[in-house]
Interface confidence: low
């Protein structure tokens, strides 16, 4: 006898991966046998070329390529949502509507939230290589590569947390070039290569001569963006300074930088970054459209020398 339609198999949420196609299933009972119609975000699908949807005789919907999506701009979440599909089964006695099934696309953005930086570590001490993977759906996994090969993580010595690599005790063999790789079903992204140098510990007593060092910060120059870092990389500057006083008493130099506040306002706290050079070095991870103050500080072991003069640089809104 005749019966109204009833949905037996509801479409399920899908992740659109690779070249496709994605399949949405819908099966219904009813007498006379119901006809199946598919809707995307409540709108019926035309199924007429060049519509990428194709209906199979059993009611399965084939999606041959992802529907057109908007493109997120700088800093915006790339919505992974391609839409909600529902199927309707109809005969002369009525219509049954399935649950909605969400189709989302695998996404892996280009830009790393944090790029690993060149650094100098001391034998026996811990150091961290920071990496903030790009936003992705599904959430990307992070692996570390050293000198072009996957880094074999040693329990107790290596820890990966939130993408960053923590090395419990630096050894001379840890010297090399490190890269952070983010992977999900949309593909993989490689960070910049970060050079790690390992120094022997130098047991300086607090060197009085460090106090006699004079540093003149001579130049702060905005570097051209690295096109490999995506459409809008974070700006980087090149610092160059001159050292006078005792013969090379400083083991390392640190950049101190902060955004400038309005006149009379309380200054922002100084951020510190160990520099890889002894007379000039790159400093990255800044923000466009900010006024910055920069200075350089020498150090040996735990002793610090006097800070250099301060130079100002206004970073443009966008390059």
């Amino acid at each position: 006898q005749d019966s109204p339609p009833q949905i037996l198999v509801h479409p399920q949420d899908q992740l659109f991966q690779g070249p496709g196609p994605a399949r949405m299933s819908c099966q219904a009972s009813g007498q006379p046998p119901p006809t199946i119609r598919w809707l995307l975000n409540g709108q019926p699908l035309s199924m007429v070329p060049p519509d990428p949807h194709h209906l199979l005789p059993d009611g399965t919907l084939l999606l041959l390529q992802p529907p057109a999506r908007g493109h997120a701009h700088d800093g915006q979440a790339l919505s992974t949502d391609l839409g909600v599909y529902t199927c309707e089964a109809s005969n002369r006695l009525g219509t049954a509507v399935s649950r909605g099934a969400r189709l989302s696309v695998a996404v892996l953005r280009e830009d790393f939230q944090i790029q690993p930086r060149d650094m100098v570590a001391v034998v026996g001490e811990q150091f961290t290589l920071e990496c903030g993977p790009p936003w992705g759906h599904p959430e990307p996994t992070v692996s570390w590569w050293k000198d072009g090969k996957p880094l074999a993580l040693q329990p107790g010595r290596h820890t990966v947390s939130g993408g960053s690599l923590l090395m419990a005790r630096a050894e001379k063999s840890d010297e090399g070039t490190y890269m952070c790789v983010a992977t999900n079903s949309a593909g993989h992204r490689e960070s910049r290569a970060a050079r790690v140098s390992i120094q022997e510990p130098q047991d300086y007593t607090e060197p009085v001569e460090l106090l006699a060092v004079r540093i003149q910060l001579e130049n702060v120059t905005l570097l051209n963006p690295d096109p490999a870092e995506g459409p809008k990389p974070r700006p980087a500057v090149w610092l160059s300074w001159k050292v006078s006083g005792p013969a090379a008493p400083a083991q390392s130099y640190t950049a101190l930088f902060r955004t400038q506040t309005a006149p009379g306002g309380q200054g922002a706290p100084w951020a510190e970054e160990l520099l890889a050079g002894w007379q000039s070095a790159e400093l990255g991870g800044l923000h466009w459209g900010q006024d910055y103050e920069f200075k350089v500080r020498p150090s040996s072991g735990r002793a610090r020398g006097p800070d250099s003069n301060v130079l100002l640089l206004r970073l443009p809104e966008k390059v």
Epitope: N41, A77, S79, D81, R102, S161, G162
Partner: antibody
Amino acid sequence: QIQLQESGPGLVKPSQSLSLTCSVTGYSISSGSLWTWIRQFPGNNLEWMGYISYAGGIDYNPSLTSRISITRDTSRNQFFLQLESVTTQDTATYYCATPGGYPFHFDYWGQGTMVTVSS
Amino acid sequence: QPVLTQSPSASASLGASVKLTCTLNSQFSTYNIGWYQQHRDKPPKYVMFVKGDGGHSKADGIPDRFSGSSSGADRYLTISNIQAEDEAIYFCGADYNNAGQYGCVFGSGTHFTVL
């Protein structure tokens, strides 16, 4: 820089509809992200109400599904909240917000508009 | 959907440290959360993203005094060298996907007072 600004009546009578507008500057609402309404009750509790995505997809808080509607006007770069059959329990500060990186982690918020439901 | 539990209040002295806790119900113990700071008569401000594995990612302009961590179902926001301007309500929030329904829930907030 993305900026959001809520507008709408500050006083609504019980059983009537509450209608609010969120005007967005600095970014096209049809280009990306989830355009979201969140409200904060007088006791400070926050409640996610729902969103409309850049593609027009919507999701609502299950507790509000029967009386909420979120729509948009891409030509004016605005999205809207409509809440039917309001009661005094709907008295709250209403915010529009959008994520800046990870979905549902809201970097950008409007200043909020206080809506009182009272006869 | 997840339920996020926060203690109603916390306090600490100027210059000290405090660790605020947001606890997820057990079946959602691996979820990532976001922390928000809200000053009186202001909208909430996004502070950071804390992952289930303890990794965290701060929003632009958030001082280094703020850090995030995780243990089991607990997500932490630690504020060190507390300043007067840190006095605020701190909320945690988590997203979820329940049978294709996406959404977000918030904890009830912790009123943090600087002594």
